[in-house]
């Protein structure tokens, strides 16, 4: 039985040209995390494997940095980075847990870095 829950940074906003940390945390389970996949709308960004370490997709390697921890740092943000991001936790013996983060990249300085925002 899967008892764990994924906590994420939720909805976040950041300024164009800036950077943001995507963070998920698995709690309420003793399952072993074997791998975390970071995805953006049907595209692989990066993988962190317990044995193999990090793999960053070639098309993102200039703008994506591993960490902190199992999180992912996106750099040199553009408005095209706006959208849904998913952390997929592969665990043993529970199976797979998925967390969702929505990132909005804003043109001006109205972004609240790393803070939740409300859509009017």
């Amino acid at each position: 039985m899967m008892t764990g829950t994924i906590e994420t940074t939720g909805n976040i906003s950041a300024e164009k040209g800036g950077s943001i940390i995507l963070q998920c945390h698995l709690s309420s389970t003793t399952a072993q995390v074997t791998q975390v996949n970071w995805e953006q709308q049907d595209q692989l960004l990066a993988i962190c494997n317990a044995d193999l370490g990090w793999h960053i997709s070639p098309s993102f390697k200039d703008r994506v940095a591993p960490g902190p921890g199992l999180g992912l740092t996106l750099q040199s943000l553009t408005v095209n980075d706006t959208g849904e991001y998913f952390c997929i936790y592969h665990t043993y013996p529970d199976g797979t847990y998925t967390g969702r983060i929505f990132l909005e990249v804003l043109e001006s300085s109205v972004a609240e870095h790393g803070a939740r925002f409300q859509i009017p």
């Epitope: 791998q35 996949n37 995805e39 049907d42 595209q43 692989l44 993988i47 494997n49 044995d51 193999l52 793999h55 997709s57 098309s59 592969h90 043993y92």
Partner: antibody, heavy 118, light 107 residues
Framework: EVQLLESGGGLVQPGGSLRLSCAAS????????MSWVRQAPGKGLEWVSA????????YYADSVKGRFTISRDNSKNTLYLQMNSLRAEDTAVYYC???????????WGQGTLVTVSS | DIQMTQSPSSLSASVGDRVTITCRAS??????LNWYQQKPGKAPKLLIY???SLQSGVPSRFSGSGSGTDFTLTISSLQPEDFATYYC?????????FGGGTKVEIK
């Protein structure tokens, strides 16, 4: 340099058994999931079985479930495929392959031919 | 099981041609799609993984695109060493499944 070397293929009668081995070198064997993929003469590729790095999880194609057993000995850097109750349709070149991150296969062995015939 | 359908099954092309091979999955597989090249008597070789990532050491004339159910392998300018059979493969779920292959022959 990553190397995967299969052995154990040969001619066997229907209903017989065979054990394939794959000796791995050039990487930390226990960190990688491994698979067996086969190719019948003149045909396409068919996935047969996979095993996690620790050996704790195994997976099989329906066509071999209950007849084939995948295993590994991480102390010997070796992958195995025990094949029982062999059928003519099991005739193929069997490749052992490395699966980093469980998303793709990045290295393949040269293959070993298994022929099931009376 | 997820079925992978490749088209065409074979094609004839000349050196320098742009070649496109398509692969369709019977259900959405996100980005879990890989492309391999195989020459007669040899093991397959990874070209593209995760739909669009170029494997290290593979020439940049090879590219992959798509997500969900429809994927494409493109060879921008066919070279003599590219005449081979190409397979797509999904790794979204077990059993892992391959397309039937596309044989690229010399025109």
């Amino acid at each position: 340099e990553v190397q995967l070397l299969e052995s154990g293929g040969g001619l066997v009668q229907p209903g017989g058994s065979l054990r394939l081995s794959c000796a791995a070198s050039g990487f930390t064997f226990s960190s990688y999931a491994m698979s067996w993929v086969r190719q019948a003469p003149g045909k396409g590729l068919e996935w047969v079985s996979a095993i996690s790095g620790s050996g704790g999880s195994t997976y099989y194609a329906d066509s071999v479930k209950g007849r084939f057993t995948i295993s590994r000995d991480n102390s010997k850097n070796t992958l195995y495929l025990q094949m029982n109750s062999l059928r003519a349709e099991d005739t193929a070149v069997y490749y052992c392959a490395r699966e980093p991150y469980g998303v793709w296969i990045d290295y393949w062995g040269q293959g070993t031919l298994v022929t099931v015939s009376s | 099981d997820i079925q992978m359908t490749q088209s065409p099954s074979s094609l004839s092309a000349s050196v320098g041609d742009r070649v496109t091979i398509t692969c369709r999955a019977s259900q959405s597989i996100s980005y879990y799609l890989n492309w391999y090249q195989q020459k007669p008597g040899k093991a397959p070789k990874l070209l593209i993984y995760a739909a669009s990532s170029l494997q290290s050491g593979v020439p940049s004339r090879f590219s992959g695109s798509g997500s969900g159910t429809d994927f494409t392998l493109t060879i921008s300018s066919l070279q003599p060493e590219d005449f081979a059979t190409y397979y797509c493969q999904q790794s979204y779920s077990t059993p892992l499944t391959f397309g039937g292959g596309t044989k690229v022959e010399i025109k």
